[in-house]
């Protein structure tokens, strides 16, 4: 399936020349990626991240999809990427609308997770799963 | 879960000793850092280093510690600090502490050992 | 490198009275890296509180914590005579420039 289309998807990336992220850090195209190794609600992570002055991570593009992919384990993670059912669209925490495919959508599974499979795939906001933050390299 | 340091003791001004931190029902791995925190007599706690207990060898320092103390993971459940140069200032109730990568706290201590720094 | 000051030593609680103790880091810090310690004499500190305002596993729901950017709080409702204890917090993040930082410690007499 494809995972993104190729309409715009409203996001802009900030530029930022930074190439230094914190410690556990990974560093990817000036922003850096957090993988936690504990696992909680897509709430909780929401805190979680927030609490690192970071947000969930936005895979918005194929490449970053790509890198998380790779430095992932074989585990589930939480990005910021929730389905409003009023809408019936998925979008970004940042509210830019997500137009790429979903799989194991489920009237239940409003959040969104990365990692055991090639795609996204849609999950229960309240099981606990890993987490992914991502915040501007300094 | 638990830990225990060993190898307190009294020692000379300007001697050396090796502590060791033995960690018990867990392996050191990627979800912890391994640390060492001191207090002194009727005083505060003072941080002094971290490794990484995984696969990285990585290892941080208070400023006042580098060059004098080294932390090192020697086994998938020990960890010890070498302490050089030491005065009666060292003399202090050494602790061993995991700290948790995701929440950067100290969850788990070990009881301590007392480091006596006297001729 | 950040340094945690907290409120002066001792501070007196009546049994089933409230006590607050503050923690105030010198720079604005994260939230998720401040956490606070109990200890008791001969006793390694335990964790009460994590990322702020979490309560550890096992510890009485009459501890909580509160606090963003320079000034942390841990509160306790209803005081028992067993938390008469020095009180620690703990900024906990440290690097290649900067390290962790524990706050001088606040002893908690209770009458």
């Known amino acids: 399936p494809q995972i993104f289309n190729k309409s715009n998807d409203g996001f802009t990336t900030t530029r930022s020349y930074g190439t230094v992220c914190p410690k556990d850090w990974e560093f990817y195209q000036a922003r850096c990626f957090f993988l936690s190794t504990s696992e909680s609600s897509w709430n909780e992570s929401r805190d979680f991240c927030k609490g690192k002055g970071s947000t969930l991570a936005i895979v918005n593009t194929p490449e970053k999809l790509k890198f998380l992919q790779d430095i992932t384990d074989a585990e589930k993670y939480f990005i910021g990427l929730i389905y409003h059912r009023e809408e019936k669209r998925w979008r970004w925490i940042n509210n830019s609308v997500f137009n790429g495919n979903v799989t194991n959508q489920n009237q239940n599974f409003n959040c969104a997770t990365i990692g055991l499979t090639k795609t996204f795939d849609a999950a229960s906001c309240d099981i606990s799963y890993r987490r992914i933050c991502e915040k501007n390299a300094k | 879960q638990s830990l225990e340091e060993s190898g307190g003791g009294l020692v000379q001004p300007e001697g050396s000793l090796t502590l060791t931190c033995t960690a018990s029902?867990?392996?050191?791995?990627?979800?912890?850092?391994m640390c060492w925190v001191r207090q002194a007599p009727g005083k505060g706690l003072e941080w002094i280093a971290c490794t990484h207990a995984g696969s990285s060898s990585s290892s941080y320092y208070a400023r006042w510690a580098k060059g004098r103390f080294t932390i090192s993971k020697t086994s998938s459940t020990t960890v010890t600090l070498q302490m050089t140069s030491l005065t009666a200032a060292d003399t202090a109730t050494y602790f061993c502490?995991?700290?948790?990568?995701?929440?950067?706290?100290?969850?788990?201590w070990g009881p301590g050992t007392l480091v006596t720094v006297s001729s | 490198n950040i340094v945690m000051t907290q409120t002066t030593s001792p501070v007196s609680a009546v049994v089933g009275g409230t006590i607050t103790i503050n923690c105030q880091a010198s720079?604005?810090?994260?939230?998720?890296?401040l956490s606070w310690y109990q200890q008791k004499p001969g006793q390694p500190p335990k964790l009460l509180i994590f990322?702020?305002?979490k309560l550890a596993s096992g510890v009485p729901s009459r501890f909580s914590g509160s606090g963003s950017g320079t000034q942390f709080t841990l509160t306790i409702s209803g005081v028992q005579p067993d938390d008469a204890a020095t009180y620690f917090c703990?900024?906990?993040?440290?690097?290649?420039?900067?390290?962790?930082?524990f706050g001088g410690g606040t002893e908690v007499v209770v009458k």
């Open positions: 029902g867990f392996d050191l791995n990627n979800y912890y850092y």
């Open positions: 990322y702020a305002s």
């Open positions: 502490a995991r700290h948790d990568r995701d929440y950067d706290d100290m969850d788990l």
């Open positions: 720079q604005s810090i994260e939230y998720g890296y």
């Open positions: 703990l900024y906990g993040y440290f690097d290649d420039y900067s390290g962790a930082a």
